[in-house]
């Protein structure tokens, strides 16, 4: 009889331990859910507020068709210019057409006048080929007008309405480009 009572007591204790464990798991799960909910709400809030304020381009960027452009107010060497653009989620300007070139040079005339601006074009040291930063070749009408007499790496820049070349280590303004946000309306 005593053994039976002892067995029942042990079973009850085991059940109690299991229930405590289940409660602990539930509490942990609830805490995890609350945390996830908090992140989710923050994320939604972030998305909604940025969507609410969303114009196709960020402040101080210029829009043309599907692109946004940023004209820098600081000088830097070509490589640092690229990094400055990446910091903003953009790359150095990649000119795809005569129309885009005309828009850029027209905008620069209005904003700043005749300065030098790095674009995402560089000359391969071995082959001498000009390539955009994504590896594509410029169209024939968009090749730098003069070949730089530099032994160092050579990069492309825009000045007035021309595409020219220079030692990548010289300091110039630069132009960044990113895609414009599509309106969902």
């Amino acid at each position: 009889k005593l053994l039976q009572v002892s067995t029942i007591a042990m079973q009850q204790q085991e059940k109690l331990i299991q229930q405590e464990r289940a409660l602990l798991n539930f509490t942990e799960w609830k805490r995890s859910c609350a945390l996830q909910m908090k992140y989710c709400q923050a994320f939604m809030q972030n998305s909604l507020s940025s969507a609410h304020n969303s114009s196709p381009c960020p402040n101080n960027w210029i829009q043309n068709r599907e692109s946004c452009y940023y004209v820098s107010e600081i000088w830097s060497i070509w490589h640092t210019s690229q990094e400055n653009c990446l910091k903003e989620g953009s790359t150095l300007l990649q000119i795809e057409s005569k129309e885009e070139m005309d828009f850029i040079t027209g905008s620069l005339r209005k904003i700043k006048g005749s300065y030098d601006y790095w674009v995402g074009l560089s000359q391969d040291g071995h082959s001498g080929r000009w390539l955009w930063q994504d590896g594509s070749s410029p169209s024939p009408g968009l090749l730098p007008a003069e070949r730089s007499q530099s032994a160092n790496q050579v990069c492309g820049y825009v000045k007035s309405n021309s595409l020219l070349s220079s030692n990548c280590s010289t300091w110039k303004y630069f132009i960044c480009e990113k895609y414009a946000l599509r309106s969902s309306v």
Epitope: Y39, A42, N46, L86, K87, K178
Partner: nanobody, 117 residues
Framework: QVQLQESGGGLVQTGESLSLSCAVA?????????MGWYRQAPEKQRELVAA???????AYADSAKHRFTISKESARNTVHLHMSSLKPEDTAVYYC??????????WGQGTQVTVSS
């Protein structure tokens, strides 16, 4: 706390291929602007190899064009670098990096890539 974990480095022969991956882990939600890979060879400066922006624009160093391919998995905050036709001069420590919306740049610990001739 943002952590970047690289993987995939190793020793290969000239002409072979190698793929590097980098996973971004964060205790909070972060808005990534761009992701990329730098490398640093002994006695040399760290240089940008390839980068990809949030909207998919690409930037490669001249030495990486037509040999290396950068790609990302936005949902998993992961960036990959596939390197083909490797040369001894590609030997370096490769570092993953991200640029985030608040202007910060974060770095991984680096993974060694050695190309033997």
């Amino acid at each position: 706390q943002v952590q970047l974990q690289e993987s995939g480095g190793g020793l290969v022969q000239t002409g072979e291929s190698l793929s590097l991956s980098c996973a971004v882990a964060s205790g909070s939600i972060i808005s990534i602007n761009s992701m990329g890979w730098y490398r640093q060879a002994p006695e040399k400066q760290r240089e940008l190899v390839a980068a990809i922006t949030v909207d998919g624009r690409l930037a490669y160093a001249d030495s990486a064009k037509h040999r290396f391919t950068i790609s990302k998995e936005s949902a998993r905050n992961t960036v990959h670098l596939h390197m083909s036709s490797l040369k001894p001069e590609d030997t370096a420590v490769y570092y993953c990096t991200i640029w985030v919306r608040d202007g910060q740049q974060y770095w991984g610990q680096g993974t060694q890539v050695t190309v033997s001739s």
